[in-house]
Interface confidence: low
């Protein structure tokens, strides 16, 4: 039977899926708080615009009896069960917010393609790319891949005079949901990253990684991995590392590197950290005070999802347009809206754009310093520190293949 949308006559509802299986282990109460804070802001913005309408959220919980792994492994069926719950209740909002696991979003997209926009905090995998009614508010794997290819090819910076064409990727299967899909994209033989590299090998065992660090016969000096500094230390410890090894540590949702009192441990000196530029006001906001850095990004994406809906609702109501139309479902892309801590830009496919930051450890100060930034919206790198105090010879990044001359 047709599911009616509670989405007209001045009353607009958001369906928020509260799934037990989630990209990040965030208490659902915190996500509710984020959504409710978003609703307050949206109501205020609509009121200020002279739009006297009601905006509410319905939280749809799964029973948690069957799908209780807590991570994304059993999320596919949980997502579909929640859709059936909505279907049986004959009640659907104007928009669906919630699925964060790539598995569940991909499957649910097959079942929501007809009518509704879907906003996700997560869904990092390549299989969720180019979905016409899906919006992703946390950086998807495609954005990471484009940065890496751009950076690999760069050879005209004072600190990077070689273009690279090789890499090892460390992926042992214990990664968090975001890292799993980021590395999955790098591993995929058909991906842009694989297509652009001449050599790429995935290291799956700790020992493989450890051996490469001093292996004279290694095929690349560059190793990509995903996680925080502690994750790297557990793997690398205090082992010696060849002087021309470069470890790229992908740790997007962690703004601890930018805190004043942080000192980089010694084992980070051969490491470039890729993270996201921290939000303007987020570190001090009341909303984020009880959240760890990663969870702050996750809950923030829920909050921004509400603000995005409010932004679109305002535009459509001001233009006298119907909300329950394909036009509305397709509209959540190629725009900038006012997010919780500043403007948020979505690309042509509804994926969030951001500023990625590549950090290095200064051998002088033992602090993390910004080497360069990368704007995912224009696929462009901007050098910041033209004379970095690197651990690498001549304060330049080494060639990716030992013994190979200038490119």
């Amino acid at each position: 039977s047709q599911v009616s949308q509670n989405c007209h006559n001045g009353s607009y509802e958001i369906s928020v899926l509260m799934m037990g299986n989630s990209a990040f282990a965030e208490p659902l109460k915190n996500l509710e708080d984020a959504v409710n804070e978003g609703l307050e802001i949206v109501r205020g913005r609509l009121q200020n615009a002279g739009l006297n309408v009601t905006v509410n959220a319905t939280f749809m919980y799964s029973d948690g009896l069957i799908h209780n792994s807590g991570d994304c492994r059993s999320s596919t069926c949980e997502g579909l069960d929640l859709l059936r719950k909505i279907s049986n209740a004959q009640r659907m909002g104007c928009v669906l917010i919630g699925p964060s696991c790539t598995y569940s979003t991909f499957q649910m997209y097959l079942d929501t393609e007809l009518s509704y926009p879907m906003i996700s905090a997560g869904s990092f995998g390549l299989s969720c790319d180019y979905k016409e009614t899906l919006t992703r508010l946390m950086s998807p794997a495609r954005k990471l891949m484009y940065f890496l290819v751009n950076f690999w090819k760069t050879n005209d910076l004072p600190f990077k005079t070689y273009s690279w064409s090789t890499s090892y990727v460390y992926k042992n299967g214990t990664e968090t949901e975001d890292c799993f899909w980021y590395l999955n994209a790098l591993e995929a033989s058909v991906s842009y990253f694989s297509h652009e590299l001449g050599f790429k090998v995935v290291l799956r065992q700790d020992k493989e990684f450890q051996d490469i660090l001093m292996d004279h016969n290694r095929k690349s000096n560059v190793i990509i991995m995903c996680g925080g500094p502690e994750f790297l230390y557990k793997l690398k410890g205090d082992r010696a590392v060849a002087e021309d090894i470069v470890i790229i540590l992908v740790d997007l949702f962690n703004d601890q590197y930018f805190e004043d009192n942080v000192t980089a441990p010694d084992y980070m000196k051969n490491v470039l950290v890729l993270t996201l530029s921290p939000g303007n006001s987020l570190l001090n906001s009341s909303f984020s005070r009880n959240l760890s850095p990663t969870k702050r990004d996750f809950a923030l994406a829920y909050l921004n999802g509400i603000l995005l809906f409010g932004h679109m609702l305002k535009i459509f109501l001001e233009n006298g347009e119907n909300i329950t139309t394909p036009k509305f479902a397709h509209a959540f892309r190629n725009l900038t809206f006012e997010g919780y801590d500043g403007p948020v830009t979505l690309d042509d496919w509804g994926d969030v754009d951001s500023t990625m930051v590549l950090l290095y450890t200064s051998v002088d100060t033992k602090k993390y310093k910004v080497l360069l930034t990368y704007d995912t919206h224009v696929n462009k790198t901007y050098p910041v520190d033209m004379s970095p105090t690197f651990t690498w010879k001549n304060s330049k990044l080494p060639n990716d293949i030992t013994g190979r001359g200038p490119q």
Epitope: Q2, Q107, L110, D111, E113, L114, S115, T133, P326, A329
Partner: nanobody, 121 residues
């Protein structure tokens, strides 16, 4: 390649019922029913999402027609009740080969040959 085959069409009196069946060689993404009356453009009738959870109908058939699917049998159905003379048309089933949004016929990749439904008054 995906093959679609419609069946169940025929001649029926106004107010009567028919059940159309569409069998496919592969069933995964959204499927739909369209119809084309003589001298008119092909028009959307109903569609059903990949998992069968969501359905959507043209205003002209809402409340009278019911679309459903059985993925275990790779089959989609259109139950047509309270048929009217203006429902007379060739009915086509269609299927997508990728997840894609949109009710227009151009958003469907595979088509059957059609089955004739004639409603007499």
């Amino acid at each position: 390649d995906v093959q679609l085959q419609e069946s169940g069409g025929g001649l029926v009196q106004a107010g009567g019922s028919l059940r159309l069946t569409c069998t496919t060689t592969f069933s995964s993404y959204a499927m739909g029913w369209f119809r084309q009356a003589p001298g008119k453009e092909r028009e959307f009738v109903a569609t059903i999402s990949g998992g069968g959870v969501y359905t959507y109908y043209a205003d002209s058939v809402k409340g009278r027609f019911t679309i459903s699917r059985d993925n275990s049998k790779n089959t989609m159905y259109l139950q047509m009740n309270s048929l009217k003379f203006e429902d007379t048309a060739v009915y086509y089933c269609a299927q997508r080969n990728i997840p894609r949004y949109g009710l227009e016929s151009r958003n469907y990749d595979y088509w059957g040959q059609g089955t004739q439904v004639t409603v007499s008054s």
